[in-house]
């Protein structure tokens, strides 16, 4: 709609709304994956750079996160991942490039990779939510 502010121009109030939508999706996806894939360790080779370092309070780095969710989509709950991607798209700065992410070929490494993405993303959302809640923006 013509009323919509371009996504990179959303105020903290709207960013907070999106984070509130993302939190249960992320939490649910992580819990379901942990139940399904018991005993899979977190990978120490994957680091999701999910926060921007150039803004105060920290902003969710949607462009860095999106490629990971697009990559794991065929291997996880597509329905939930699509909802997460839809929300992240709203937070994406226009014209920001997305890098290509490849999923490890090894089955065990792949499971560890997915678990790590989900855990880091959940922690990231928590961090952004706290910063949005802590007084003046």
């Amino acid at each position: 709609s013509s009323h919509m502010a371009p996504t990179h121009q959303l105020p903290p109030s709207d960013v907070r709304k999106i984070i509130l939508e993302l939190q249960p999706l992320s939490r649910g996806l992580l819990e379901d994956y942990q139940k399904k894939e018991t005993g899979v360790p977190e990978s120490n080779r994957t680091l999701l750079l999910c926060l921007t370092s150039d803004s105060q309070p920290p902003r969710l780095n949607s462009s860095a996160i999106l490629p990971y969710f697009r990559a794991i989509r065929p291997l996880s709950d597509k329905n939930i991942i699509d909802k997460i991607i839809e929300q992240l798209d709203k937070l994406k700065f226009q014209h920001e490039p997305e890098t290509e992410i490849s999923v490890p070929a090894d089955t065990f490494e792949c499971k560890s990779f997915i678990l790590t993405i989900l855990q880091q993303f959940s922690a990231c959302l928590e961090s952004v939510f706290k910063s949005l809640n802590s007084g003046p923006q």
Epitope: S1, H3, H8, Q9, L10, P11, R16, K17, Q137
Partner: antibody, heavy 118, light 111 residues
Framework: EVQLVESGPSLVKPGGSLRLTCSVT????????WKWIRKFPGNKLEYMGY???????DYNPSLKSRITISRDTSKNQYYLQLNSVTTEDTATYYC????????????WGQGTSVTVSS | DIVMTQSPASLSVSLGQRATISCRAS??????????MHWYQQKPGQSPKLLIY???NLESGIPARFGGSGSGTDFTLTIDPVQADDVATYYC?????????FGGGTKLEIK
Amino acid sequence: EVQLVESGPSLVKPGGSLRLTCSVTGDSITSGYWKWIRKFPGNKLEYMGYISYSGITDYNPSLKSRITISRDTSKNQYYLQLNSVTTEDTATYYCARYGNYGYAMDYWGQGTSVTVSS
Amino acid sequence: DIVMTQSPASLSVSLGQRATISCRASESVDTYGRSFMHWYQQKPGQSPKLLIYRASNLESGIPARFGGSGSGTDFTLTIDPVQADDVATYYCQQSYEDPWTFGGGTKLEIK
């Protein structure tokens, strides 16, 4: 045309609970954000909170311990419950739609007046 | 919370003249060059009606006599020329930060 209509009791006893209904036509409450706002006798407007298209709720911290917003998507209605009311909660209560990020509340109900008195 | 201070509290203007209402936010409501400040009109016995969104955008169906300007912390609603139908209370509201907050209102009367 989007229409919102508030309904509920006009008189509530102190210490009791206030429950209001907002009936929406012309749009689905499974899209956008659906807000409650109230206007006190002195004309001051206060934002109370919302329920989102997915059912997520968020409240004004000043009311957090007393307020619940819920919905029934089959009836296209959403609700405000305010507990432990006092005479300070006497106000006209409005429901409103926030349809788009970065926009404003474009449709409001006509308002329903609630008096808290014994 | 962001405090919205409106002035004057009441305003009496002759028909055909200009009415100017000010709103000041206790902190900036801008992000990336956009102002998340809106103006509403409330006539007696009616609900608030959106006039201006994001500081200067005229809502669909609102006459061009209404205009909004400002950025950061200082905003203005202008009605020019004032008509008899404009008798109402006008409110500013910020949607920059939660909780959303409103100005105290400005009551417009005709001289």
